[in-house]
Each structure stands twice: as structure tokens, then as C-alpha cells.
Amino acid sequence: TQHGIRLPLRSGLGGAPLGLRLPRETDEEPEEPGRRGSFVEMVDNLRGKSGQGYYVEMTVGSPPQTLNILVDTGSSNFAVGAAPHPFLHRYYQRQLSSTYRDLRKGVYVPYTQGKWEGELGTDLVSIPHGPNVTVRANIAAITESDKFFINGSNWEGILGLAYAEIARPDDSLEPFFDSLVKQTHVPNLFSLQLCGAGFPLNQSEVLASVGGSMIIGGIDHSLYTGSLWYTPIRREWYYEVIIVRVEINGQDLKMDCKEYNYDKSIVDSGTTNLRLPKKVFEAAVKSIKAASSTEKFPDGFWLGEQLVCWQAGTTPWNIFPVISLYLMGEVTNQSFRITILPQQYLRPVEDVATSQDDCYKFAISQSSTGTVMGAVIMEGFYVVFDRARKRIGFAVSACHVHDEFRTAAVEGPFVTLDMEDCGYNIPQTDESTLMT
């Protein structure tokens, strides 16, 4: 998004770890109702891979029609393919559902990449490997789309888990999760563990592989190690957070922290990459290039266009730096950091010509709509979307890909001053993101 005005940027914001221990909430605190530690029936209910999205099985209509639905925390519509399409094996057939109700209203949704159009209605919806409830939810029946469905992705719809403010056609269309919480006793919280494979998966492997877990209504302690650290949800539209500092291999990027959140920073399971504002991207790439300078990579690699390949099993992970994002903590002047490895930001892809090699794409890219913490970030962590307490929790994922020398990390507390000033006050518009 282009904005004519940029707010004056603040400088001199400290974000250095001072070794000072600040009070924090840990997972030892008394658990709230519904936050029991085990949700066996929901564990491993996601499939997919970071490049094409993670999906959960859902049923719609009466009798139930089973569909695979992309889990997207960067949008707020529940929308399913409802007409034949070359990339869809199945689709929602409204005429076969006795409980379908037509809302007699159209909807059009453009994403960063891809668009769809459809007709609004409501129907009964449930999640077989989720809470044992059925809810009447708004459904957009997708009748037309362009660059939206992905060939071979195995999903037929999208579950927008963000807030009503960004729902289309407007915020009066109640999102699925709001309907779920309103109509049942499910607590207002969900958590995601996205498990990157660490190697490319072919179609049959994706179908057989476990992609992770969406725990609806709670937190499963088996899905993470260490403590959960929470950052406030700045505003309930996207899952907007505030980044206060960025380090590459422990080296501060030393930018005004407002740049990191220009024009927002969001947690988005429906985007593949870690996307960074132009200035931040340029600084980060410069720093990552410098850190990995023992090998030379073509410019196209850093632009995410070209693959780099190594002989199977010889990827030099150690030459690539770790990346740390410091997030605003729950306590004044307190932050914590999440650290990802190259195993997260180098995305494995199949190279047909050299199937013996391990090939990767650089999964950090430039954004004109702020920072997007997409699947490559989320694959390192168990992420708790605690809507009830307006916060997002991060802990090291029990399934993240790492090596014997380094692991993803969530660490704190760190003293960081003036964190509120890191937020950018965006002129009001609405956008949606998806798998870019």
C-alpha cells in the first residue's frame, strides 16, 4: 500500500539484552477453563507444506460434505470452492445440503496474490478432528477464482481466522471462529503448530505426511518445549504485533524500530515467506549475505527467484545466520526474542533436473504492506492465538527442523524502552494476504 505521508521515525530505541529478569507469565500459571494440556483428538490434524499452505479437514452441510480447508490467520472469510475448477478434486455442492441458507449477497476477495468471487450463505460446519461441535457459520461459496487454488495443494477452501474488521464484504459478516465461540463452550483461543518437513515432499508424501496441529480452544503442552512467551495483539483486525528489534546472528540491524512495523506486522499462516518492508528487507539481506559470504549466491536467489542446490546431505547450514525478531512483551519495557534457523528460511523445493540434490529457495521477501510472519517463521514455533486475552504466544515447536548445533529459540526477558513508538499508525484500509 502506498501512503503519501510517513510518520517521523524515532531513533535511539534501546533493545539490547541487559540480563535483567523481569516478571513474566509462564505456562506454570493456573490454567483457564478449556486450557487443559492435552488435546489428543486435534493433534496432527493438519497436512500440507509451507509453500502451498496447511489445511484441516472440515465438513459442511447436511449430509456432511468433507473438504480440506486452508488455515489462514491473515484473512477472515470462510470460503470454499463451490463450482468445478481444474485444480479441485471436490467442491461444496449447496444444492445437496438441506441446511444451506442463501444470504442473497455476493462477495469478492482479492489477496496479495489471487482473487476469488462467490455467493454468501450459511450452513452447518464441523471439524472432524476438532471440538465435537457443529456450528452454523457464514460460508462464501466460491464460484470464480484466479490464481487462488493451487494445483496439487489438496485444499478446496480457506478458513480465515482473523477478526471481523477485515472480513469481506464488510465487518458485519461474522467470521467462523467468532461463530464457533458464540455458539459453543469452546474457549476463545486456538493454537497452531506448523511442521515444515525440511525436505521437499511429493504429492503422495504430502498426503501421507503430518503437517502439524490446530488446537481449537486450548494449548497442548506436548507440542512445544520451554516456556510460552506472549506478545500483545496490537489491534484486532489481522493478528497485528509489534517487532522492537531485529538481529542477524546476534548483530542488531540498528534500524528505527518503526521501520520493522511499517505499515504493520502480522502473524499469517496463509503466507509462505517471512516478508519484510523494503528497507528492512534490504538491510537484512545485506547482513545475511555478509554472514554467508564464504559461498557466493546469484542475485536471483536473494530475490526468491532462483534455487540453490547442494549434493544431498551437504547443505552448509552453518554458513547461514540465525535471525532473531524481538517482540513487545506483556510487561512494560519488556521484550522477548524468537530466533529462526536457515532450516526455516531456506525452503526446500524439488528440482526436477537434479533430484539427487537438496535444493532451496530463499523464503524471505520484500513487502509493501509491512512485515508478514508467514509459515517459515511459524514452522519454528508453537503459536498460541489467545484472542480472549488479546495476545499471541510463542514457544519452540516440538517439530521444528534443526541440526545438532543450533535450534530455534524463544528467549527473554529483555529490557526494551519506548516500544509503543515502534508501532505505525496506519491510515484505515483493509487488505488480505494469502500464500505469497
Epitope: T1, A83, P84, H85, Y108, P110, T112, Q113, K115, W116, E117, T143, E144, S145, D146, K147
Partner: antibody, heavy 117, light 112 residues
Amino acid sequence: EVQLQQSGAELVKPGASVKLSCTASGFKIKDYYIHWMKQRTEQGLEWIGKIDPADGETTYDPKFQGKATITADTSSNTAYLQLSSLTSEDTAVYYCVRSTLVLFDYWGQGTTLTVSS
Amino acid sequence: DIQMTQSPLSLPVSLGDQASISCRSSQSLVHSNGYTYLHWFLQKPGQSPKLLISKVSNRFSGVPDRFSSSGSGTDFTLKITRVEAEDLGIYFCSQSTHVPYTFGGGTKLELK
């Protein structure tokens, strides 16, 4: 309010090229498609082609391939139609049109192009 | 290319009359997704065309309910139940099922 503001009338010589513009307000062109139509007096409407400004992908009526080039600049929220090797056959009113995947919902006011020596 | 043929070429009416315009396509307009992308536009003198109806029968927002349209495959009809002065102009049918998109030659609705 959604509007498509087209550039002013053009009088150009045969053989020359011209670039017509269409500036959008009230929406982002990257969220829609922009089409160009040609209307000659007593000749009805012809679809020239369209662009998806989100990625620059274009589709043309084969009969306008080589004659027309559609581009878009998302930073200025403007779409363009360039017409080359102009002849009197190109004299017409040209419209830019916004569409979703289905609805051709907003039309520009039209630009009159006259090709004459 | 799909040929779109409209009839009549001109339709003289009195205010309050019912008017009916036909549009025929040289090939079926049913898309592989099952939908039919046949649309109607009205161009008033000195103005740009405006969308009236999309996908055979869906009235665009703000279009009065005296406009209706029906049809399938290759044969379509636009009906205006009680013609008002603001309805006068040239009506075009158009298809966007097949590329290139094509328009009918137009039907001029005018006063008798």
C-alpha cells in the same frame, strides 16, 4: 467513490503511437482487473484486452495483439493502453473498465482518439 | 470468436410499455464451471455503458427490478416491464465465458 479518470482526447497522425491513461480513485487497481474497450461510431463495442495489475498478466483479443499494449502502474493506481502504427481504423472512443472476476462494474468516461493527417 | 447477435436493431416504445430484447450467441455460453457469463449493459446518449445484469439474471446494485433477464445456452432475453424515460439508450449484451470477450451490436430503445 469509485472513479476511472481517462486522459483527454488525442489527435494523432497515421503511423504514430499513442498512450492513453486511466487513473483510478476510490479503490486499488491491484485488487481488480482493468479492461480496455474500443467503440467506433456505428460499430458497437470491442474488447481489446485486460490486465491483472497485481502481477502484470495481460490477455488480448488476438486481433489487437501487436496493435495494443496494456500496462499498469500500481504505485500511481493507473492503467495504460498504448496503440501503435495508427491508422484511421483506430479512430474510436476507448474506455477503460474495472472488473472483478465477473462484474464489469465501473467504466471510465472514454477517450476519443482521432487518427488523421 | 463468439458472435453475439441482438434483435431488434431498434425498438420504438411508449413510456409504460413492456420491452423485450433478444441476444443470441454462436456457441453455448456455459462455462466449464457450470455458470453462464452473459451480461447486459445500457449506454445512454453521450455516456459510458453501465452494467445492468450479470451472469444472465443477476441485477447489479441500484438497477431497478423492472429489469429482468433470462435464458440459457445460446438464447437470452432482457425484459423491461414498464419503460421509463431514463431507460432509453442502446442496450448491449456481452459474453465473458470465452476469450476474446464479445459484444452484441446493440439495440436502440427509443420513443415511438
